[in-house]
Amino acid sequence: KLTIESTPFNVAEGKEVLLLVHNLPQHLFGYSWYKGERVDGNRQIIGYVIGTQQATPGPAYSGREIIYPNASLLIQNIIQNDTGFYTLHVIKSDLVNEEATGQFRVYPELPKPSISSNNSKPVEDKDAVAFTCEPETQDATYLWWVNNQSLPVSPRLQLSNGNRTLTLFNVTRNDTASYKCETQNPVSARRSDSVILNVLYGPDAPTISPLNTSYRSGENLNLSCHAASNPPAQYSWFVNGTFQQSTQELFIPNITVNNSGSYTCQAHNSDTGLNRTTVTTITVYAEPPKPFITSNNSNPVEDEDAVALTCEPEIQNTTYLWWVNNQSLPVSPRLQLSNDNRTLTLLSVTRNDVGPYECGIQNELSVDHSDPVILNVLYGPDDPTISPSYTYYRPGVNLSLSCHAASNPPAQYSWLIDGNIQQHTQELFISNITEKNSGLYTCQANNSASGHSRTTVKTITVSAELPKPSISSNNSKPVEDKDAVAFTCEPEAQNTTYLWWVNGQSLPVSPRLQLSNGNRTLTLFNVTRNDARAYVCGIQNSVSANRSDPVTLDVLYGPDTPIISPPDSSYLSGANLNLSCHSASNPSPQYSWRINGIPQQHTQVLFIAKITPNNNGTYACFVSNLATGRNNSIVKSITVSA
């Protein structure tokens, strides 16, 4: 099929286009090109007769067209009007006609765009800026670039006017950037030159450097001021409110104590009309100043707060030193020094961090020490302790209980009896008590600073008769030759005698037996299996006496070296071998057997029927006590004769 291909399809003004013919039939008489989508003699561009090789211009011929023998048409120096359809009319030798239509589009070659702005010096946080890409061109696409990147997504950036206008609302100093616009159509793309947005801002609050505020007499004072500003700020210095000079730097050589005072830097921006000031207080010491310690928290709470201790004053080129409890700083993950060693931070203070703390400033000749300081760490209250520890009293005596809980500030105490508030004192005194004074005595300690409270409850029994005592033990299953056991006779009662019996006998004299705590506690050191006896304690006073139920001590021991029975070691072939192993142990041990080193069974008895000489060898019994963690074994040789 006859087709027309336009090369290129999109043609720039002034360039050329080739209408290329494909599938041209054979045996042609000639052909003609027409402007438009149909054959119209009034719009003929050119005709061509193959036989004569004669080209004849038509009414639409502009002088820019060239026809080729292969019927292709070249149009040069394209103008906008050339846009549209072109029809090729082919006349074959048999006078049968054939037509094909092609088309192309003409676009202008875009000029280099430029950016116009409605505000050349916008003020930060106040003005908006609208950039417009010039010129306005039909059928062109507009793009924008910021610092050679595509536009960022921002609510302050808005495109309008077919993307030809870029508006920046509420400009900031960060909008100071290189802006470019680009125009594109199908035949060209052009970028503008950069436009730098010049945002006026500031001045910000000036910074005076160095930060050092303490100087020694005779030094030079050289202060520099800087404030972020566009255009650059104009600077003025004031000392104690009096104008000095309009420079960015203030230099005073060989200062004296009289140069102490407030130094103000004023920064002025002539375009924004704004002024900002910063004041620093300079102290000039006649001699090295005595350092002192300041704290960011004068009442830190234990296990909650961190405390930063700072060595004052701050002096340039100075080494700072610290001591705690008259020692150099210990290595601790809770102690941190700042880079310049001037600040010591205690992370998560405890009541043991009170100090004292000292800091020092090292100069060429000596170290100047601060006065020591201590920390007031708030803590507690801990669980209160009620003393004395007696729980049994006889009627008629005075009951005097004292309560104490570690706390800072000191705890405030309250006493409750059977849940009823009695008094707000550290001590509770009741004279001439009776059985009615028996009950639950609660001491409540309150820390007013932290708001925390802790309580301890004590049961007080007032009785003429002593109660039946009981024995408590600190170790219910002691291991032989290793552990000690402390038996305590409960309860603790006032004016009471404590007695002990072992297997119904009074205590034997032994260096391993020790009485303490007013005979209330009986300690057995290095227990042995022979200590596994019945222990009884007794209490008595002038009115009554009572004994506890016996407590039997369960001593863990063994396993001892095992014994294999029967003792025989020679057997006749065909006999039964029946070996039994036994070891003294508490609790009973676990047994296992090995024959010639090969594990057999985990039983106390080893039985082999109808033995032969093949059963000769070493028979080992192993014993293990899981409670004591100890092991033992014995080996026996067995000979079987034929």
Partner: nanobody
Framework: EVQLVESGGGLVQAGDSLTLTCTSP????????MGWYRQAPGKQRDLVAD?????????NYADFAKGRFTISRDNVKNAVYLQMNNLKPEDTAIYYC????????????WGQGTQVTVSS
């Protein structure tokens, strides 16, 4: 603010004894080294004796106090004591107690003190 309360002073004869007591409702003395100080009219405040924190096993005395004065502490009662024996007229002064060194972040505040007057 740290509040310190001194008590136990009074007018006594030369050779008599007195026991001064120091407590505080706002500061727990337990961890701190504590001191008794005195200030006679027209003179500066001087350290009389000090006692280490915790169990108070370490004590120090000014020369004039050695052998006559005893400093002690009771952490349960949050109290520091100064037992003064064989008092002399030159012991007449206002007696103060305080932590041995300043507490950081707190102005060094002193209590009212307790007046001790020894007549000959």
């Amino acid at each position: 603010e740290v509040q310190l309360v001194e008590s136990g002073g009074g007018l006594v004869q030369a050779g008599d004894s007195l026991t001064l007591t120091c407590t505080s409702p706002t500061l727990t003395f337990t961890p701190y080294r504590m001191g008794w100080y005195r200030q006679a009219p027209g003179k500066q405040r001087d350290l009389v004796a000090d006692i280490s924190g915790g169990d108070g096993r370490t004590t120090n005395y000014a020369d004039f106090a050695k052998g006559r004065f005893t400093i002690s502490r009771d952490n349960v009662k949050n109290a520091v004591y100064l037992q003064m024996n064989n008092l002399k007229p030159e012991d007449t002064a206002i007696y103060y107690c305080n932590t041995y060194v300043a507490i950081v972040g707190h102005a060094r505040s002193w209590g009212q003190g307790t007046q001790v007057t020894v007549s000959s």
